[in-house]
C-alpha cells in the first residue's frame, strides 16, 4: 500500500531498520551511534550550505519474537514485517536504511512498490545486483568476481606470467554472510566467474580441501576460500602443501593485516590475502605505520548511508527539486560523496567502489606486503611490489595447472 513519506516542508526523516537478523553481529547500539554521528554531520553540512531544514532518523526495531536466529537465515520475513510496521504506523521516511541480509533485501525489493531509495550495508548476493533504487555500501559479490577474473587473466606482470583458467572453491556452509554470498557467486554456474573459467570445482568437505593440498592429480593449483587466517589454520593446520599451490583467502572486511607488529604465521606463506584498502591513506608496499582504525566497516556503512542521504538531499534542495519523486529514488548512483573516512564512489548501479588489496607473506620479513591493488571502479589492477619475496619458485606465481610452468 502507498505510505505517506515524512519528507517535506523542511522536515526530512530517515527510516532505519534495526533488524535482529543482520549480516554482521554488530550491537544495535553501535549502529545507532553511527547513525547519530551521521545525522550531526549532515545537519552541519546542510546548515553550512544555507539550508535551514530538519533531518532526523526513526529507528524501526523488530520485535524479535519470531525472527530470532540472529543471522540472515530468517531475515526474509523480518524485513517484510518491519515494512508492514512502517506501513501501519504511516511512518515512512525519505529513505530506507537497512536491511543488510541478501534474502531480506531481495524480498523487500520484490514485494514493495519502491518509490523511495533503499540503502544497504550488505546485501552482498548477485540477486541484489542491478536494482534501480537499491544502493549497497559494502563491496558486493559482483565486484569480487570481476577482480578474480581480471587477476586470473593477467599474465604480463613480473610476478604473474601465466593466465589462469582453473580454480577450486572451498565452501563448507559455515561461512559468514559476506563470505556465503561471495562464494555463492563463484559457485553459480551462470556467473561471470564460472563463464570465464575452464575448470572450477567446489570443495565442500574439510577432507576434500586437505587432500587437494598434496594431490598429484589435482586439476588446479589455485584454491579460493573466504575467511580469516584462523579459519584457514583450523582447516589446513600445519599440513604440508605442494609448492605450486596458491590459496586465495578472501577477507575483505578485516584490517588486522595493516596493524603494527603483525607477523604472518608460517601457514600463510602459500596464501594471497584479498582485503580492502584501509581507507584514506595511500598504501605503500610495507607497513611501518599504524594505518588502520578498528574494524568497523558495517557500522561505517550505516554512517555513510546517512551522509549519502544528506549529500543527495542537499543537491535536490539546492536545485529546488522534490524529494518524494522517482527521480530522487533513482539518483543514489553514479556519484562520489564525502564519506566519513573520505570520498565514497558509487557505480552506475549504486554499488560502492573500492580499492581491493592483494597481500602476500614476505619470506624475508614474515610480514604482509602489498602485491597489487585493484580499483573496482575502472576494473584495473595496479602492481605495487615488482620484486616480491614469494615462497613460490623464482618469486613468480605458478601456473594454475600442475605440470606446466615453474614447479
Amino acid at each position: 500500500s502507498q505510505v505517506s513519506q515524512n519528507c517535506h516542508n523542511g522536515s526530512y526523516e530517515i527510516s532505519v531498520l534495526m533488524m535482529g537478523n543482520s549480516a554482521f553481529a554488530e550491537p544495535l547500539k553501535n549502529l545507532e551511534d553511527a547513525v547519530n554521528e551521521g545525522l550531526e554531520i549532515v545537519r552541519g553540512r546542510l546548515q553550512n550550505a544555507g539550508l535551514n531544514v530538519t533531518v532526523n532518523a526513526t529507528f524501526m526495531y523488530s520485535d524479535g519474537l519470531i525472527h530470532n536466529s540472529g543471522d540472515c537465515r530468517s531475515s526474509t520475513c523480518e524485513g517484510l514485517d518491519l515494512l508492514r510496521k512502517i506501513s501501519n504506523a504511516q511512518r515512512m521516511g525519505c529513505v530506507l536504511i537497512g536491511p543488510s541480509c541478501t534474502y531480506s533485501t531481495f524480498q523487500m525489493y520484490l514485494d514493495t512498490e519502491l518509490s523511495y531509495p533503499m540503502i544497504s550495508a550488505g546485501s552482498f548476493g548477485l540477486s541484489c545486483d542491478y536494482k534501480e533504487t537499491l544502493t549497497r555500501l559494502m563491496s558486493p559479490a559482483r565486484k569480487l568476481m570481476y577482480f578474480l577474473v581480471n587477476f586470473w587473466k593477467t599474465n604480463d606482470l613480473p610476478f604473474k606470467t601465466y593466465s589462469w583458467s582453473t580454480s577450486y572453491v572451498y565452501k563448507n556452509g559455515t561461512e559468514t554472510e559476506d563470505c556465503f554470498w561471495y562464494l555463492n557467486a563463484l559457485e553459480a554456474s551462470v556467473s561471470y566467474f564460472s563463464h570465464e573459467l575452464g575448470f572450477k570445482v567446489v570443495l565442500r568437505q574439510d577432507k576434500e580441501f586437505q587432500d587437494i593440498l598434496m594431490d598429484h592429480n589435482r586439476k588446479s593449483n589455485v584454491i579460493i576460500m573466504c575467511g580469516g587466517p584462523e579459519f584457514l589454520y583450523k582447516l589446513k593446520g600445519d599440513r604440508a602443501v605442494a609448492e605450486d599451490i596458491v590459496i586465495i583467502l578472501v577477507d575483505l572486511f578485516n584490517d588486522q593485516y595493516f596493524e603494527d607488529n603483525v607477523t604472518a604465521p608460517d601457514y600463510m606463506k602459500n596464501v594471497l590475502v584479498l582485503t580492502l584498502s584501509p581507507g584514506n591513506s595511500l598504501l605503500n608496499s610495507s607497513f611501518s605505520r599504524n594505518l588502520s582504525p578498528t574494524k568497523r566497516d558495517f557500522a561505517l556503512a550505516y554512517l555513510n548511508g546517512i551522509l549519502l542521504f544528506g549529500h543527495m538531499l542537499k543537491i535536490f534542495l539546492e536545485n529546488g527539486e522534490n524529494i518524494t519523486t522517482p527521480k530522487f529514488a533513482h539518483a543514489f548512483r553514479n556519484l562520489t560523496f564525502e564519506g566519513y573516512d573520505g570520498p565514497v564512489t558509487l557505480d552506475d548501479w549504486g554499488d560502492v567502489d573500492s580499492t581491493m588489496v592483494l597481500l602476500y607473506t614476505s619470506v624475508d620479513t614474515k610480514k604482509y606486503k602489498v602485491l597489487l591493488t585493484y580499483d573496482t571502479h575502472v576494473n584495473k589492477t595496479y602492481p605495487v611490489d615488482m620484486s616480491p619475496t614469494f615462497t613460490w619458485k623464482n618469486s613468480k606465481l605458478p601456473n594454475d595447472i600442475t605440470g606446466r610452468g615453474p614447479q
Epitope: D33, R289, N290, L300, Y340, D341
Partner: nanobody
Framework: EVQLVESGGGLVQPGGSLRLTCAAS????????MTWVRQAPGKGLEWVAK????????YYPDSVKGRFTVSRDNAKNSLYLQMDNLRAEDTAMYYC????????WGQGTLVTVSS
C-alpha cells in the same frame, strides 16, 4: 598506550576565554574524526564540537556556534577547543573523544564559568 589527555580547564569569568587541549597518543590520530563533549553538573552528555580527520570539516551545535572553535594539529597529535565569550551555562567537565562511536575518552578537564 592508547590514550587521550585533556588540559586547559579552569575558573573563568563570564565573557572570558579558555583554550582546551587534548593530547592523543598510541594511535594514528590523523585518521580519526574527533569530538569535544561536555557534561554539566547533573546533566547528560552534550557534544560541542566535531572535526574531520584532516580538519576539513568542523561542526557545532547552536548552543556554542560562533563562540567555540575547534582545531587540530595532526603533526602534534593534538586537538584544541578555543572557547570565547563564555557563559555560566558552559560550566561543565569537557572531554575529547575519538571516532563516531566515541570508543576512547580522556579523563576530562573542568571548566567553571563564574563571577
Amino acid at each position: 598506550e592508547v590514550q587521550l589527555v585533556e588540559s586547559g580547564g579552569g575558573l573563568v569569568q563570564p565573557g572570558g576565554s579558555l583554550r582546551l587541549t587534548c593530547a592523543a597518543s598510541g594511535f594514528t590520530f590523523s585518521r580519526y574524526w574527533m569530538t569535544w563533549v561536555r557534561q554539566a553538573p547533573g546533566k547528560g552528555l552534550e557534544w560541542v564540537a566535531k572535526i574531520r580527520h584532516d580538519g576539513g570539516e568542523k561542526y557545532y551545535p547552536d548552543s556554542v556556534k560562533g563562540r567555540f572553535t575547534v582545531s587540530r594539529d595532526n603533526a602534534k597529535n593534538s586537538l584544541y577547543l578555543q572557547m570565547d565569550n563564555l557563559r555560566a551555562e558552559d560550566t561543565a567537565m569537557y572531554y575529547c573523544t575519538r571516532d563516531y562511536n566515541k570508543d576512547l575518552w580522556g579523563q576530562g578537564t573542568l571548566v567553571t564559568v563564574s563571577s
